[in-house]
């Protein structure tokens, strides 16, 4: 004969465990139903009556099957330097991440607690390491033959243009100014092949290669963090 299906609440077999989405109530000494995400236990079970669940109150949530007496409070509204990437609902907490141009200086289990503005490299300096979701920009001085004339958190040092005739030599914060009508842009060491000789400049050395990838904004996209575990939840 097939085993009878037990309806909650029921006493488990000696040494046995409760089924999925049930929990063992110590007071009633019975297997009782858990409440689904978005709800909490309004009335705990007894020997003769099952758990009574109720919807989470405004601005609270439960993410897992549970038997908590109160839902968890959602986090505060996102601050002005943040964007809400996940709204507070009955089943999930609010997640705030840093808006473009900012990074997370102090993270929390989900999202970010404190955002800080990405460092801007001043003229003469370029981005050595782009900012990420959780780290600031690192700047470096532009090497000989390269320049940056912007204050930017994304611009790298770029090679000076190579002139047929130089009007004003370039430096770390300014590109070279040519007198000829068709300057050539140096892209990388040994990569420039000109059909005629160019004027030499004592300060012009081979430009250092630029980082292989220019930083974009993709690093600001939120990475889904793992959800928090509630005190007395889990299947």
């Amino acid at each position: 004969l097939p085993a009878q299906v037990a309806f909650t609440p029921y006493a488990p077999e000696p040494g046995g465990t409760c089924r999925l989405r049930e929990y063992y109530d110590q007071t009633a000494q019975m297997c009782c139903s858990k409440c689904p995400p978005g709800q909490h236990a309004k009335v705990f079970c007894t020997k003769t009556s099952d758990t009574v669940c109720d919807s989470c109150e405004d601005s609270t949530y439960t993410q897992l099957w549970n038997w908590v007496p109160e839902c968890l409070s959602c986090g505060s509204r996102c601050s002005s330097d943040q964007v809400e990437t996940q709204a507070c609902t009955r089943e999930q907490n609010r997640i705030c991440t840093c808006r473009p141009g900012w990074y997370c200086a102090l993270s929390k289990q989900e999202g970010c607690r404190l955002c800080a503005q990405l460092r801007k490299c001043r003229p003469g300096f370029g981005v050595a390491r782009p900012g990420t979701e959780t780290s600031d920009v690192v700047c470096k001085p532009c090497a000989p033959g390269t320049f940056s004339n912007t204050t930017s958190s994304t611009d790298i040092c770029r090679p000076h243009q190579i002139c047929h005739v130089v009007a004003i030599p370039g430096n770390a914060s300014m590109d070279a100014v040519c007198t000829s009508t068709s300057p050539t842009r140096s892209m990388a060491p040994g990569a420039v092949h000109l059909p005629q000789p160019v004027s030499t400049r004592s300060q012009h050395t081979q430009p250092t290669p630029a980082p292989s990838t220019a930083p974009g904004t993709s690093f600001l996209l939120p990475v889904g963090p793992s959800p928090p575990a509630e005190g007395s939840t889990g299947d």
Partner: antibody, heavy 120, light 108 residues
Framework: QVQLVQSGSELKKPGASVKVSCKAS????????MHWVRQAPGQGLEWMGR????????KHDPKFQDKAVLSSDTSVSTAYLQISSLKAEDTAVYYC?????????????WGQGTLVTVSS | DIQMTQSPSSLSASVGDRVTITCTAS???????LHWYQQKPGSSPKLWIY???NLPSGVPSRFSGSGSGTDFTLTISSLQPEDFATYYC?????????FGQGTKVEIK
Amino acid sequence: QVQLVQSGSELKKPGASVKVSCKASGFNNKDIYMHWVRQAPGQGLEWMGRIDPATGNTKHDPKFQDKAVLSSDTSVSTAYLQISSLKAEDTAVYYCARSPYGDFGAMDYWGQGTLVTVSS
Amino acid sequence: DIQMTQSPSSLSASVGDRVTITCTASSSVSSNYLHWYQQKPGSSPKLWIYSTSNLPSGVPSRFSGSGSGTDFTLTISSLQPEDFATYYCHQYHRSPWTFGQGTKVEIK
């Protein structure tokens, strides 16, 4: 844009009942609560109750538990407040206001108000 | 019930004055659940400060809010003609949700 449009003024006799409507537009009715707040002439704001239009669940100030019935019809995006056994002291402007779920009860949009006058 | 008591009930001030309104709760209120509304005669209330210190878009930056526990304040750093109105605090911490009795800001 978000709008809450309430029904017009009402003049009622003592003992009668009145039903005030609040039609919502410009937002999803699913993740909000609709509150009812009253203001007697020259007085302050008094929270009466709220309804979750998605589930029909209501919560009242106990003072209004037997006086006010909250309901909603999601098919027409309208919330209703019915007040029974009207007395002269129920003369007031009745406002509907919404609060989005997760905004800690901040009522960010209000109806224009409905004046209910109870007089014999 | 949590009683919300505002002080003063009314005040007269001049344009340019700094104005502070206080709201005292009879028991502790989480700062997320404390809001302020502005109401002008013949108009519906408007959400003016939410969660103790946050300004909705359109509210001038001369308004600020602060506080925790049982004591909360709304401050106008430099009163302007359009600020003359009644201000209400509101707690959503525990049902029934309650408003303060209001503070009327009048022209001196």
